[in-house]
């Protein structure tokens, strides 16, 4: 079974900078999985943001600002990255990655 690890416990950025969050997949080939990213703002329900499927297809939640989030995967390091552009107050949250095995 696949296992996920988010090595960064926290990431501190100044306004308008870029944050990159990592999710390391083990126990399964990342190319054979879909990785989903979610965020949980304080006091709010968890929200789906973006996913990258086994074939590389990216799906973004409607209503998420255009260009705010970018998802990628690096098979060599078995890692999925979530890039948050122009960090703002509204981006303060806990971000989770999740796995769906094909």
């Amino acid at each position: 079974a696949g296992h996920l690890e988010q090595p960064q416990i926290s990431s501190t950025k100044t306004l308008s900078k870029t944050a990159r969050l990592e999710c390391v997949v083990s126990g399964i080939t990342i190319s054979a999985t879909s990785v989903y990213w979610y965020r949980e703002r304080p006091g709010e329900v968890i929200q789906f943001l973006v996913s990258i499927s086994y074939d590389g297809t990216v799906r973004k939640e409607s209503g998420i600002p255009s260009g705010k989030f970018e998802v990628d995967r690096i098979p060599e390091t078995s890692t999925s990255t979530l890039t948050i552009h122009n960090v703002e107050k509204q981006d303060i949250a806990t971000y989770y990655c999740a796995l769906w095995e094909v």
Epitope: S16, P42, N86
Partner: antibody
Framework: EVQLVESGGGLVKPGGSLRLSCAAS????????MNWVRQAPGKGLEWVSS????????YYADSVKGRFTISRDNAKNSLYLQMNSLRAEDTAVYYC??????????????????WGQGTTVTVSS | EIVLTQSPGTLSLSPGERATLSCRAS???????LAWYQQKPGQAPRLLIY???SRATGIPDRFSGSGSGTDFTLTISRLEPEDFAVYYC??????????FGQGTKVEIK
């Protein structure tokens, strides 16, 4: 002293348009979320719209959604409110207001700490 | 949408008296997201309290805020002549709308 100065108000006929401006001085606008708040004659405060520091997150009150557009030009240290399809009920004093910002890991609200003096919009035939 | 209801609508008091203003939310509001403002005739509002209980810069210590959940209170311990004004509570979160209460007018008795 940090300051916000609104302009662009005036008398307009129903269905008309106006563009309000808000100029910031002695602080860097790009570091703050900004808001428009209005107050109809003899009434209370009504939040109208907000825009995040990098313009990614934009919100409107239901009463103005689809008619008003908030924007900002951080290079010019200015905030704008484009108002279209104006109605009599849009008559109010319009204030721009600065959201004091955030720090740390908590989404913490510090209030609207700097307000402009207001600009009056009157919609009447 | 969270609705904030302020009471009383008008508070008639004399200088030196204690004023207690109430703000009740239709659903629970994080105390981190509750602010109070003062507005005098012909002037823009002024931030008094943020985070339900923290005084904004330059606000005298006779103003204090308290409460959590759905019930919040602004207290003015001893009214000064310049405190007679309209007071608004406001809730704010990471999603809109960022509503204000309808206001409480503190007038001279």
């Amino acid at each position: 002293e940090v300051q916000l100065v609104e302009s662009g108000g005036g008398l307009v006929k129903p269905g008309g348009s106006l563009r309000l401006s808000c100029a910031a001085s002695r602080f860097t606008l790009s570091s703050y979320d900004m808001n428009w708040v209005r107050q109809a004659p003899g009434k209370g405060l009504e939040w109208v719209s907000s825009i995040s520091s990098s313009s990614s997150y934009i919100y409107y009150a239901d009463s103005v959604k689809g008619r008003f557009t908030i924007s900002r030009d951080n290079a010019k240290n200015s905030l704008y409110l484009q108002m279209n399809s104006l109605r009599a009920e849009d008559t109010a004093v319009y204030y721009c207001a600065r959201d004091r910002g955030v720090g740390g890991t908590d989404y913490y609200y510090y209030g609207l700490d700097v307000w402009g003096q207001g600009t009056t919009v009157t919609v009447s035939s | 949408e969270i609705v904030l209801t302020q009471s009383p609508g008008t508070l008639s008091l004399s200088p030196g008296e204690r004023a207690t203003l109430s703000c009740r939310a239709s659903q629970s509001v994080s105390s981190s997201y509750l602010a109070w403002y003062q507005q005098k005739p012909g002037q823009a509002p002024r931030l008094l309290i943020y985070g339900a209980s923290s005084r904004a810069t330059g606000i005298p210590d006779r103003f204090s805020g308290s409460g959590s959940g759905t019930d919040f209170t602004l207290t003015i311990s001893r009214l000064e002549p310049e405190d007679f004004a309209v007071y608004y509570c406001q809730q704010y979160g990471s999603s809109p709308p960022y509503t204000f209460g309808q206001g409480t007018k503190v007038e001279i008795k």
